[in-house]
């Protein structure tokens, strides 16, 4: 019989490549059974995950699976840097995996590095 | 049933580039990374590198990096890997491998190989 | 880059003896969300490698419980408590902590 507790399915270790003044949406893979939880969405901050309050948010239906999503209208150079989505079930809270933002600053860039070349940079998260 | 299947050249030459295709079938590839891995001929096995699917982001073996390319095609569900500038000591076994998701992220399945020797 | 270097480099036991393989990482493999990702992979000849152990200890569905895997940290150890016909072949273990990846060296199990 298949679990009924919530499952966030953010991969482990992923990154995404994107671009200041781009528009971009943060997906959070929620898996549940019966009530959809309550989910969130924070910024790390060294080892302290901060929650964002008062950011576009929204849902995704597909079949098997909802996704909560965070809004970046447009994406800024303050954006880089690791998230967390966390589900309060029953009493509980399920975090996922942290994805990373490598934002390229269109403006100090003379043209758009490869997305491998951002997986070499991890200063980028700092400055 | 999840399968992955290598295809590509047996023989490349001195300089040229090599390039394999990983067929998927059974998954979704854009739920998982794939990877490749070689093996030499009588040798261990060195990691190469893996793509993420969903959005294309590769992370790469830094004494490979300048001569990869690792890229995917998610309506093919396939992967696919180019290695420039080869030499005969990149003649081995390519395997590409399937990372499977919540909560292990293991490589669970495999390919079964395709050898690729680097002669003129 | 993570080292893995595991100990012995081959193995020769007679069927029924007990294999003993360590697996030595240079930095701990502890990730961030508390999960150790030190796999254990066997190949026969010929065939690709097959996971046998992830998670340091978890077997993999269909592995006898003959083989287990233990250890934490930097220090890990793959042992079949009795060695059969079909266990020869070559072990590795496998880092999926860092990046890059890294294999250890394998070690060659014969019989006697």
């Known amino acids: 019989k298949e679990s009924c507790d919530v499952q966030l399915y953010i991969k482990r270790q992923s990154y995404h490549s994107i671009f200041a003044g781009d528009p971009f949406k943060l997906e959070c893979p929620v898996k549940y059974c019966a009530h959809r939880p309550q989910v969130t969405w924070c910024k790390l901050n060294g080892t302290t995950c901060v929650k964002l309050e008062g950011r576009h948010t929204s849902w995704k239906q597909e079949k098997n699976l909802s996704f909560f999503i965070l809004h970046f209208e447009p994406v800024l150079p303050s954006d880089n840097g690791s998230y967390r989505c966390s589900a309060n079930f029953l009493s509980a809270i399920i975090e996922s995996h942290s994805t990373t933002l490598y934002v390229t600053d269109v403006k100090s860039a003379s043209e758009r590095p490869s997305k491998d070349e951002m997986a070499s940079r991890p200063w980028l998260l700092y400055s | 049933q999840v399968q992955l299947q290598e295809s590509g050249p047996g023989l490349v030459k001195p300089s040229g580039t090599l390039s394999l295709t990983c067929a998927d079938s059974?998954?979704?590839?854009?739920?998982?990374?794939i990877h490749w891995v070689r093996q030499p001929p009588g040798k261990g096995l060195e990691w190469i590198g893996r793509?993420?699917?969903?959005?294309?982001?590769?992370r790469y073996n830094p004494s490979l990096k300048s001569r990869v390319t690792i890229s995917s095609d998610k309506s093919k569900n396939q992967a696919s890997l180019k290695l420039s500038s080869v030499t005969a000591a990149d003649t081995a076994v390519y395997y590409c491998?399937?990372?499977?998701?919540?909560?292990?992220?293991?490589?669970?399945?495999w390919g079964q190989g395709t050898t690729v020797t680097v002669s003129s | 880059d993570i080292v893995m270097t595991q100990s012995p480099d081959s193995l020769a036991l007679s069927l029924g003896e007990r294999a003993t393989i360590n697996c030595k990482s240079s930095?701990?493999?502890?990730?961030?969300?508390?999960?150790?990702?030190l796999n254990w992979f066997q190949q026969k000849p010929g065939q690709p490698p097959k996971r046998l152990i992830y998670?340091?200890?978890k077997l993999d569905s269909g592995v006898p419980d003959r083989f287990s895997g233990s250890g934490s940290g930097t220090d890990f150890t793959l042992t079949i408590s009795s060695v059969q016909a079909e266990d020869v072949a070559v072990y590795y273990c496998?880092?999926?902590?860092?990046?890059?990846?890294?294999f250890g060296q394998g070690t060659k199990l014969e019989i006697k």
């Open positions: 998670l340091v200890s």
């Open positions: 059974g998954f979704n590839i854009k739920d998982t990374y």
């Open positions: 930095q701990s493999l502890l990730d961030v969300d508390g999960k150790t990702y």
């Open positions: 793509i993420d699917p969903a959005n294309g982001f590769t």
């Open positions: 491998a399937r990372e499977d998701g919540y909560p292990y992220y293991t490589l669970d399945a």
């Open positions: 496998w880092q999926g902590t860092h990046f890059p990846r890294t």
